[in-house]
Amino acid sequence: GPLEVEPPDSVVAVSMGGSRQLTCRLSCADHRAPSVQWRGLDTSLGAVRSDAGSSVLSVHNASLSAAGTHVCVGSCGNLTLQRTVQLLVFAFPDQLTVSPVALVAKQDREVACTAHNVTPASPEALSLSLLLGDRELGEALSREVEEEPQQGEDLLFQVTGRWLLPSLDTPTPPALHCRATMTLPGVQLSHQRAIPVLRSLTSREPPGTTSPEATPELSSTRSSESPAPPAGNSSARPCRPKIHQSPAAGGLELLCEAACGPGVAVGWTQAPGGLEAYQRREAGAQAWLSVPRAGCGPEGWFQCRLDPGGQMASLYLVAEVCSPPAPP
């Protein structure tokens, strides 16, 4: 018979800190004893339990380093069969924050929503949306990706979307929610957070609450992850640089700065296509970089670094819809 793998997908995604089992089975037609084993080509295998005709690979407390290519090799006599499974490890804890925590009708026009401690952070996997009632507001004004302060070997990100709100000046403003969705092969997970809309500026908190609670709405297809534990907050975090963007003639200006007191400097260390393609200016704790928006504009990671200390800040810019090159 064929070599059977459960789950049958060629890509299996597991949440960070979660567990997953991959089972490989083979039966031989001629009553010969089959041989089945898992091999990790580029990763440590985890725990493997094999007996005649089956092999079970168990991944517990998955970290990003558990990701990789696993091959199940089965044989019946001289016939050898193989199946490859790519294990992905993602992080998507229920850690959504919104700013402001409550909106004042007629006054607040912009809202930001941030998903914390996630990976991957690219738009194809992680989408952020703002829901007004059951209607999704259009494209975000901007999307920013920054590295979280590193805790252990796993590099995680915070992704922030910003939206401009329509007028909320109706007798009963519709409910406002921020939703984050992680989509990977075999996995679709969503978290949602309500943003209270206040009628007037008497209080920033809705009556009867201390702070708006997250309202997770978890839906998953073909996934059996254990939820990842929330990342611990470290109180004494080192001083970190931050990247700000502002529009400039013909493009964007990025400012990397660190408010860490005297004796520190920041500098740009990475940009799509190489730093030499950009105009830069550095002055102690501030460094500027000009991003032209000709054609599609650059797409990729901009990174700056703090010295001394080596802390990094990163920003991922998505290329905008292409404007055709200006006529000569």
Epitope: V11, T84, T119, P120, E124, S127, P185
Partner: antibody, heavy 124, light 114 residues
Framework: QVQLQESGPGLVKPSETLSLTCTVS????????WSWIRQPAGKGLEWIGR???????NSNPSLRGRVTILADTSKNQFSLKLSSVTAADTAVYYC??????????????????WGQGTLVTVSS | DIVMTQSPDSLAVSLGERATINCKSS????????????LAWYQQKPRQPPKLLIY???IREYGVPDRFSGSGSGTDFTLTISSLQAEDVAVYFC??????????FGGGTKVEIK
């Protein structure tokens, strides 16, 4: 065994749209990422773009605006449309399965299964 | 874009001898956080599609003969065929997958028998 097979017209007129389909067997297109790659005669390989689980796409910025990649999960197929073609688009077009990984929050890939390729000539 | 440059363009080696192909990236494809190098090698025989040989710069794809090996880190990489066989006559390509979009390939190196 995973198999991919490209199909579509071998001849396209300049300024028209090139359309190709890739039929996949041995794997579900909804459980992976899938790419189109092309190779002009005697030249190197150029990644065109890919489609992924959520139905979204990435494409090569050098072709941006001309590339559309769609999936039909009911037929286990994905397709490529390349608009406004010129003679420079003459090439063997391959579909391939991405082996994806996660790095720096991105999802790059290399290619572990390829179709046999189909030659598309752009000529009037 | 990360530009991948291969050398030489072609190479003639006697059967049983060592063949060495080089690939250089315009920026580092080594990710220091996990110490992985995001580079793959492919073999393309005449009238066939490319076949994956090596990824992470040095991991052989399952079923690839052990005479093929990959090495290098950062920006300079090498594919070595330790003892060339007749069936190894092909064009070999490197590919970076550190940065997307786009994923980029080298121009190819043609290996022939001397």
């Amino acid at each position: 065994q995973v198999q991919l097979q490209e199909s579509g017209p071998g001849l396209v007129k300049p300024s028209e749209t090139l359309s190709l389909t890739c039929t996949v067997s041995g794997d579900s297109i909804s459980s992976n990422y899938w790419s189109w790659i092309r190779q002009p005669a005697g030249k190197g390989l150029e990644w065109i773009g890919r489609i992924y689980t959520s139905g979204g796409t990435n494409s090569n910025p050098s072709l941006r605006g001309r590339v559309t990649i769609l999936a039909d999960t009911s037929k286990n197929q994905f397709s490529l449309k390349l608009s406004s073609v010129t003679a420079a688009d003459t090439a063997v077009y391959y579909c391939a399965r991405d082996r994806i990984t996660i790095i720096r929050g991105l999802i790059p890939s290399f290619f572990d299964y390829w179709g046999q390729g189909t030659l598309v000539t752009v000529s009037s | 874009d990360i530009v991948m440059t291969q050398s030489p363009d072609s190479l003639a080696v006697s059967l049983g001898e060592r063949a060495t192909i080089n690939c250089k990236s315009s920026q580092s494809v080594l990710y220091s956080s996990n110490n992985k190098t995001y580079l793959a090698w492919y073999q393309q025989k005449p009238r066939q599609p490319p076949k994956l040989l090596i990824y992470w710069a040095s991991i052989r794809e399952y079923g690839v003969p052990d005479r093929f090996s990959g090495s290098g880190s950062g920006t300079d990489f090498t594919l070595t065929i330790s003892s060339l066989q007749a069936e190894d006559v092909a064009v070999y390509f490197c590919q970076q997958y550190y940065s997307i979009p786009p994923l980029t390939f080298g121009g190819g190196t043609k290996v022939e028998i001397k």
